[in-house]
C-alpha cells in the first residue's frame, strides 16, 4: 500500500496533465485529489503513466468509489482497465456499448479473459438482456466472447438475434451454452429450406437432441465430420448405422480416421459389428454377431 504523506505546496495538482509522470508514487497519492481524477478521467489515457503510477490512480478511485465506479469513469479508464480484477468489475453497472467497445479495444492482446468475461456479464445485466446491438458489438470487437457468458445470461438472447451470431463466435462455447442457444437457433431458422437451414443451424448443433439429429439424417445434408464430432455424445449414441451413413453421406469414410475419438468410439461400441461391416470402412469394436444386448435398466424398472 502507498504510504500517506502531505503534499508539498509546489506539487499541488489542479488538473490531470503530463507533468504528473514526474511524480513519485507517494507524491501522486498525496497530491492527486480523487474527485479531480474522476472528473478528468478522459485525460488519463493520453498520459504515459508507468504501471506503478497507474496502481496509485486505481487506489484513489477505489477509495472514492468503494461500491464500484460510475459509468462516466469506467468509459474513460483506458489502460487503467488493465489493472482491474474481476472482483472490481463485478461492482460495476455498465449499460453503454461505447464503454464496452472502448474497454474491449484496450484489453486486446492482453491476458484478460476473466476480466472481459465479467465486463460482458455486467453489460448484459445492465442492459437487461443480450440484445442485437450487444451481440453485434461482441462479434465485431471480441470474437468468441459470447461464449464467456454463462448459460443463464445466454438464456436472455431473443431468437431474433441469433442470426447475427457467426460460426466463429460459437467456437469456444461449451455443451451447456449450446444447450441454451440451440433451441433459439432452431426457432430462428425454422422457416428456411433444408440446405439453407443446415448451413445456419450447423454451428449450434452441439446442443441438438437425438430426434433432431435423426431428422437431419433424412434430409441429405452430408454433415462433415467436424460437425458430427461436436454433437453431444448422448445425441449420437442412439443413432443406427444406417442413420449415420445417411447423415454423413460421402463424409462417412471419415469415421475410420476418427474411430479412436469420442463420440465416434462410443458410438462404434454400441453398434452391431455386422452393421458396421456394411460401411466397408474396417471399423472394429462393435458388438459381436450373435450376442444379445440386455438393457438392465429396463429389467430393474419392472422388478
Amino acid at each position: 500500500d502507498v504510504e500517506r504523506t502531505t503534499c508539498p505546496p509546489e506539487k499541488e495538482v489542479h488538473e490531470i496533465d503530463e507533468s504528473l509522470i514526474f511524480y513519485k508514487k507517494r507524491e501522486l497519492e498525496a497530491c492527486v485529489d480523487a474527485a479531480l481524477l474522476a472528473a478528468q478521467m478522459d485525460r488519463v489515457d493520453a498520459i504515459p503513466f508507468t504501471y506503478e503510477q497507474l496502481d496509485v490512480l486505481k487506489h484513489k478511485l477505489d477509495e472514492l468509489y468503494p461500491q464500484g465506479y460510475p459509468e462516466s469513469v469506467i468509459r474513460h479508464l483506458g489502460h487503467l482497465f488493465l489493472k482491474m480484477s474481476p472482483e472490481d468489475i463485478r461492482k460495476w453497472n455498465v449499460t453503454s456499448l461505447e464503454t464496452l467497445k472502448a474497454l474491449l479495444k484496450v484489453s486486446k492482446g492482453h491476458e484478460m479473459s476473466a476480466q472481459v468475461a465479467t465486463l460482458i456479464d455486467r453489460v448484459v445485466v445492465g442492459r437487461g438482456q443480450l440484445d442485437k446491438d450487444t451481440v453485434d458489438t461482441l462479434t465485431a470487437f471480441c470474437p468468441g466472447c459470447l461464449c464467456s457468458l454463462s448459460p443463464e445470461r445466454l438464456s436472455s438472447v431473443p431468437p431474433s438475434v441469433i442470426g447475427a451470431v457467426r460460426p466463429q463466435d460459437l467456437d469456444t462455447c461449451g455443451p451447456r451454452q449450446l444447450d441454451v442457444l440451440y433451441p433459439k437457433a432452431r426457432l430462428a431458422f425454422q422457416n428456411m429450406s433444408g440446405s439453407e437451414y443446415f448451413v445456419k443451424i450447423r454451428p449450434f448443433l452441439g446442443g441438438a437432441p437425438t430426434e433432431d439429429v435423426k431428422a437431419l439424417s433424412q434430409q441429405n445434408v452430408s454433415m462433415d465430420l467436424a460437425t458430427f464430432m461436436k454433437l453431444r455424445r448422448e445425441a449420437v449414441l442412439p443413432l443406427t448405422v444406417a442413420e449415420v451413413q445417411k447423415l454423413l453421406g460421402p463424409h462417412v469414410e471419415g469415421l475410420k480416421v476418427e474411430e479412436q475419438h469420442s463420440p465416434v468410439r462410443d458410438w462404434i461400441l454400441k453398434q452391431r459389428q455386422d452393421d458396421l461391416d456394411t460401411l466397408g470402412l474396417g471399423l472394429q469394436g462393435g458388438i459381436p454377431n450373435g450376442y444379445l444386448i440386455l438393457d438392465l435398466s429396463v429389467r430393474e424398472a419392472l422388478s
Epitope: D171, A226, E258, G282
Partner: antibody
Framework: EVQLVQSGAEVKKPGASVKVSCKAS????????MDWVRQAPGQGLEWMGD????????IYNQKFNGRVTMTEDKSASTVYMELSSLRSEDTAVYYC????????????WGQGTTVTVSS | EIVLTQSPDFQSVTPKEKVTITCSAS???????LSWYQQKPDQSPKLLIY???NLASGVPSRFSGSGSGTDFTLTINSLEAEDAATYYC?????????FGGGTKVEIK
C-alpha cells in the same frame, strides 16, 4: 492466411519435461484436429498423437503413452504438447500439423520446434 | 502397426527426367487413406498428394499418385530443380498412423 506458429527451441536435461506450444490463426480452430509429428536429426517422420480442440479428446501413439500429454486452450486457439522423462533419443524437431476432422492428411504444418536433450 | 517401406532410399536424377517412388505397405491400406509429403532441407513437410491421387492446392501437375492395396506410387513426370527434396508416404488407414522412411531426390 492460415498459420501455425510454434514456440522456440528448447534445451533440456535427461529426465526433464518440455512443453511446446502451437498457436493457430486464420481458420475455425475447432474444425481441425491438431496432430504432432517429430523428426529426429537425419531421420524420417514419426506421428505422436492428436488432439480434437473441440472436445479436448486425445489419441496418442502407444510408443509415447504415459510420457506425452496434449492439451488445448480454445480461447487462445493454441495447443500444447508436453513430453516428460526426456532422454537423448527425444532430441528432434517437433511439428504441429492441422488435420481436417474426418481426414488423415496434414494440410498445414508449423515451422517446427527443435528440442535438444543433453546432459 | 502398418510399416511403409519406400524405395529407392535415394535417387539422383537429371532435370526433365521422370521419377518414380514406390511405397509398399505391410498390410492393406484403404486408398482414401494414403498421402504423400515433400520436405526440403530445413523446412517443414508440405502436403503433395492426398487420398492416393488428389493433388493438394498449389502443387504442379507434373506430380501424380496412384496405387491401391499395399502398393502405391508417386510420380514426378518431368523433374525440375526445385523438386530436390525428401518425399514421404503416409497412411491413416490403421492406427497408429505411420510414415514411410523417405526417399531423397537429388538433382544431378
Amino acid at each position: 492466411e492460415v498459420q501455425l506458429v510454434q514456440s522456440g527451441a528448447e534445451v533440456k536435461k535427461p529426465g526433464a519435461s518440455v512443453k511446446v506450444s502451437c498457436k493457430a490463426s486464420g481458420y475455425t480452430f475447432t474444425d481441425y484436429n491438431m496432430d504432432w509429428v517429430r523428426q529426429a536429426p537425419g531421420q524420417g517422420l514419426e506421428w505422436m498423437g492428436d488432439i480434437n480442440p473441440s472436445t479436448g479428446g486425445t489419441i496418442y501413439n502407444q510408443k509415447f503413452n504415459g510420457r506425452v500429454t496434449m492439451t488445448e486452450d480454445k480461447s487462445a486457439s493454441t495447443v500444447y504438447m508436453e513430453l516428460s522423462s526426456l532422454r537423448s533419443e527425444d532430441t528432434a524437431v517437433y511439428y504441429c500439423a492441422r488435420r481436417r476432422i474426418g481426414t488423415g492428411y496434414f494440410d498445414v504444418w508449423g515451422q517446427g520446434t527443435t528440442v535438444t536433450v543433453s546432459s | 502397426e502398418i510399416v511403409l517401406t519406400q524405395s529407392p532410399d535415394f535417387q539422383s536424377v537429371t532435370p526433365k527426367e521422370k521419377v518414380t517412388i514406390t511405397c509398399s505397405a505391410s498390410s492393406s491400406v484403404i486408398s482414401s487413406y494414403l498421402s504423400w509429403y515433400q520436405q526440403k532441407p530445413d523446412q517443414s513437410p508440405k502436403l503433395l498428394i492426398y487420398r492416393t491421387s488428389n493433388l493438394a492446392s498449389g502443387v504442379p501437375s507434373r506430380f501424380s499418385g496412384s496405387g491401391s492395396g499395399t502398393d502405391f506410387t508417386l510420380t514426378i513426370n518431368s523433374l525440375e530443380a526445385e523438386d530436390a527434396a525428401t518425399y514421404y508416404c503416409h497412411q491413416w488407414s490403421s492406427f497408429p498412423y505411420t510414415f514411410g522412411g523417405g526417399t531423397k531426390v537429388e538433382i544431378k
